[in-house]
């Protein structure tokens, strides 16, 4: 592990041998002030106590400033997703500086000495700052540091050692390995800053977990439940990339969230809204699409300060690439059945038809079991905007599609000979839309005829009878 | 699948120097690194050093940092160490393997190199 | 550099024991130790990584434990197959380092 020494920290890797034997002397930690979109161009080193680089590359004092910080690299140089999000910030604050924190000797090394580096990192980060509050007009509140994966723990231990309270930490998807159940000064924490956002999009409960489960932010978003991203698995990075293997499904999931924040940035009009919840599966539910008492956020650069909240988990689903915001529904169906239907879980899906456009012919996902004689709720979501919901349709996938339904088909029959039809009675749906928070009630067209049977579909209409529309809409909503 | 090939054994003389070869298939090559294990008779696994293809990086135990040269060659897809001033010391199994990052584990093994050095 | 610790080199066991193998550190390694099978042709395979996580593909009578400088591979039900080398190695930092490895055969 290379041991930084020298004022500005400098490294000497010993066991790294290059072709021709040669000790090579880098910086460990620089500040690059990014003065162009560019990423070819130099931009501008910034170094403590000394003052000519900030006039000569005309930092602004009295703007916003970000300092990217990026996580472990095996490469040893920059990721695409740097100067992406450099230039997604530059077409959004046009007056702001950008920093990029190279700190890429420390963290081109095995993991877990790039962890152990990260404290001495931050610590650099730390002087700078504490530097740069001695400029007159330097504001800390206006500095938000961004660190993705090793990154955002580099960023809590900035804001940990700086002298004051940093405007906001951004985390992008905060490391796992070595953090996971960390006391809060050895990892990023709602204390690091005014204000900590995180965005979780590699977690998991097997193998591995590259991300960090655990909230660690004032808020801690968990887009599509923090795990399988859409547009990631094998097949889609097959697709891709000669050879996919299970390293682009990692690097992609985890790196989703860095693209989820530079969506937030460039796609202004299309935010993207989570909703807090306890956990995955209560989301997965469709039971909390509530913005009532700040239960909603945008997500990314636009997220609302929540000071008050500390590890609130918040949930949204996403698609598979940018723009990423889809429109979230709650469907809640009473459902009765006269006719038992056994121990196979229907298969129903739902087309939505608004003003604007139809859905797509969506699955209800059951992600425990069907409660018959109860009100259920469903989560279902679309790519586009539909605009306000004029009928629904539902319908009730045929029989036997796998050998599982085909057996407990056959063994329903068995258990139930002179009653074998399956069929539910649904008279109304309850729709409430989690981005307009708008709720409307629909019912069958005709009472008489609300049975629904396998292979079957019920067609619904916005009640008659003084259907309900609360138009309450969400403090987040038409932001642009 | 993932594939490392191992070149054939060698029988060399004290003093001279050899190169084994670890051709990787069923994976993007310059995503990985290769590291290097030695192996002698009946004995235990000891660390030699890593290769990673994406961007040149070496690494090397202290101890073989004398002893061994890591290269690769891109368009074929092969890691190759090079042992050099050659003793019976060195005679020995060398494996090569595949890093999985983050885990820092050898996820997947050549079938091994047996080198004998005898006059 | 880490020294890694088998203290038994070779065990003997019958056909569906249940054996576990042990590995000490000489300081914390936070998680990051692996277990390796040797087999008698020389083949080597990666069992468990990160103290317990099951490599793809291994059948689920291994398991992993520990935490800190002690830790321990367990076969629940030894099978045939089983019979080889087992080596645990370290990967908290370089030199990687393994340990001696225990020998298992059937009794």
């Known amino acids: 592990s290379p041991v930084p020494f020298g004022p500005e920290g400098r490294l000497e890797d010993k066991l790294h041998k290059p072709k021709a034997t040669q000790t090579e002397v880098k910086p460990s930690v620089r500040f690059n002030l990014r003065t162009s979109k560019d990423p070819e161009h130099e931009g501008c080193y910034l170094s403590v106590g000394h003052s000519q680089p900030l006039e000569d590359c005309s930092f602004n004092m009295t703007a916003k400033t970000f300092f990217i910080i990026h996580g472990w690299t095996m490469s040893g140089i920059f990721e695409n997703w740097l100067h992406k999000l450099v230039s997604a910030l530059h077409t959004r604050e046009k007056d702001a500086n950008v920093v990029v924190v190279d700190w890429l000797p420390l963290a081109h090394q095995l993991y877990t000495d790039a962890v152990n580096n990260t404290r001495v990192v931050g610590h650099s980060i730390a002087r700078m700052l504490d530097w740069l509050q001695e400029k007159d007009d330097f504001s800390l509140g206006n500095v938000h540091l961004i660190g993705y994966s090793l990154g955002a723990h580099v960023a809590g231990y900035a804001g940990n050692f700086v002298k004051g309270t940093v405007g906001r930490i951004t985390g992008l998807d905060p490391a796992g390995p070595m953090f996971e159940g960390a006391d809060i000064h050895k990892r990023l924490s709602p204390d690091d800053a005014d204000f900590v956002d995180v965005l979780h999009t590699y977690t998991r409960s097997f193998g591995l977990s590259i991300g960090i489960q655990m909230p660690v932010g004032h808020i801690d978003i968990y887009p599509n439940g923090g795990d399988f991203q859409p547009g990631c698995g094998l097949n889609d990075v097959l697709g891709s990339i000669a050879y996919g293997t299970i390293t682009e499904v990692v690097k992609c999931e985890h790196e989703r969230a860095v693209h989820l924040f530079v969506d937030s940035l460039v796609n202004q009009d299309k935010p993207s809204f989570a909703f807090q919840c306890t956990d995955s599966n209560r989301f997965k539910k469709g039971i909390c699409l509530s913005c009532r008492k700040n239960r909603c956020n945008n997500i990314g650069y636009n997220a609302k300060k929540m000071r008050k909240k500390r590890n609130s988990k918040m949930y949204l689903k996403t698609r598979a690439g940018m723009p990423f915001k889809v429109y979230h529904y709650q469907l809640k169906v009473h459902m009765f059945s006269y006719n038992n239907s056994g121990d196979t879980q229907p298969t129903l899906y739902i087309t939505l038809y608004g003003s604007n456009a139809d859905s797509q012919n969506l699955p209800l996902e059951i992600v425990e079991k069907i409660e018959l004689n109860a009100t259920n709720t469903f989560l279902v979501y679309t790519e586009e905007d539909l605009g306000d919901l004029l009928k629904m349709r539902l319908t009730w996938e045929g029989v036997a599609h796998s050998w599982y339904n085909l057996w407990n088909e056959f063994r329903n029959y068995l258990s139930q000979p002179s009653n074998p039809s399956r069929e539910l009675y649904i008279r109304r749906i309850r729709v409430k839309s989690g981005e307009t928070q708008r709720k409307v009630t629909f019912c069958t067209q005709d009472p008489t005829k609300s049975s629904i049977s396998p292979g079957q579909e019920l067609w619904f209409h916005k009640c008659q009878d003084g259907w309900k529309m609360k138009n309450k809409t969400s403090p987040f909503v038409n932001l642009a | 699948q993932v594939q490392l090939q191992q070149s054939g054994a060698e029988l060399v003389k004290p003093g001279a120097s050899v190169r084994l070869s670890c051709k990787a298939s069923?994976?993007?090559?310059?995503?990985?690194?290769i590291h290097w294990v030695k192996q002698r008779s009946g004995q235990g696994l000891e660390w030699i050093g890593w290769?990673?293809?994406?961007?040149?990086?070496?690494k090397y135990n202290e101890k073989f940092k004398d002893k061994a040269t890591l290269t690769a060659d891109k368009s074929s897809r092969t890691v190759y160490m090079e042992l050099s001033r050659l003793t019976s010391e060195d005679s020995a199994v060398y494996f090569c393997?595949?890093?999985?990052?983050?885990?820092?584990?050898?996820?997947?093994w050549g079938q091994g190199t047996l080198v004998t050095v005898s006059a | 550099d880490i020294q890694m610790t088998q203290t038994t080199s070779s065990l003997s066991a019958s056909l569906g024991d249940r054996v576990t193998i042990s590995c000490r550190a000489s300081?914390?390694?936070?998680?990051?130790l692996n277990w390796y099978q040797q087999q008698p042709d020389g083949t080597v395979k990666l069992l468990i990584y990160?103290?317990?996580r099951l490599h793809s593909g291994v059948p689920s009578r291994f398991s992993g434990s520990g935490s800190g400088t002690d830790y321990s591979l367990t076969i629940s039900n030894l099978e045939q197959e089983d019979i080889a080398t087992y080596f645990c190695?370290?990967?908290?930092?370089?030199?990687?380092?393994f340990g001696g490895g225990t020998n298992l055969e059937i009794k």
């Open positions: 990160y103290t317990s």
């Open positions: 069923g994976y993007t090559f310059t995503k990985y690194t």
């Open positions: 300081q914390d390694i936070s998680n990051y």
């Open positions: 393997a595949r890093h999985e990052e983050y885990t820092n584990s050898l996820a997947y």
């Open positions: 290769f990673y293809p994406g961007s040149d990086s070496i």
């Open positions: 190695q370290q990967g908290y930092t370089l030199p990687w380092t």
